[in-house]
Amino acid sequence: LDLSNVQSKCGSKDNIKHVPGGGSVQIVYK
């Protein structure tokens, strides 16, 4: 299970991976 593009809704932005667009996002960052 590849979770490399998962973005936390409540965690630090430090963990955000730079993906090439919204199509690669799994959770909308709040």
Partner: antibody
Framework: QVQLVQSGAEVKKPGSSVKVSCKAS????????ISWVRQAPGQGLEWMGE????????YYNEKFKGRVTITADKSTSTAYMELSSLRSEDTAVYYC?????????????WGQGTLVTVSS | DIVMSQSPLSLPVTPGEPASISCKSS????????????LAWYLQKPGQSPQLLIY???TRESGVPDRFTGSGSGTDFTLKISRVEAEDVGVYYC????????FGQGTKVEIK
Amino acid sequence: QVQLVQSGAEVKKPGSSVKVSCKASGYTFSDYVISWVRQAPGQGLEWMGEIFPRSGSTYYNEKFKGRVTITADKSTSTAYMELSSLRSEDTAVYYCARDYYGTSFAMDYWGQGTLVTVSS
Amino acid sequence: DIVMSQSPLSLPVTPGEPASISCKSSQSLLNSRTRKNYLAWYLQKPGQSPQLLIYWASTRESGVPDRFTGSGSGTDFTLKISRVEAEDVGVYYCKQSFYLRTFGQGTKVEIK
């Protein structure tokens, strides 16, 4: 308030390079992507590429690959776009824009634009 | 590459009347996980930098008048202006950010 301030107009010779700067203020520079977009005279908008300052990771428009380099200096909150092997068709206004990365992926703040003229 | 096509390319309008711009993408811009369409609309007024109007296909940016409405999903999108005002003249661009970024050709809106 959020501001993106770009460097001044440039006149360049064909075959040379240009480096345009974009100084950000009013937000945490590392939290947003900076995109570069150009507009030739009387033409539409063309996305060139982007950088995520936190990691230095970049994506480029295939059209410009090998000719464009986008960098960022976190210590000064400044992004740079360098375009090499300039030709007359590169005459355009070059914009930097803050891209709301991770949510809308929309460019919510734009610089004032930098006119680059390529002429012999 | 995702190709964005706008129509019409030129739109003469009468103040107070509605206006509509179409934008079509060569592939779907809907992310089924986030349930968002990664489509934005921008207005570039004469002599100015572009400004964001709509993102996620239908969410109005803060400060944008409610006469601007974005709609659509997948590959077909529309920007509607309910009652055009003189200050709305300029070039309107749609832009996809599903994969990298691509702008439409632009639609020039001018007063008749």
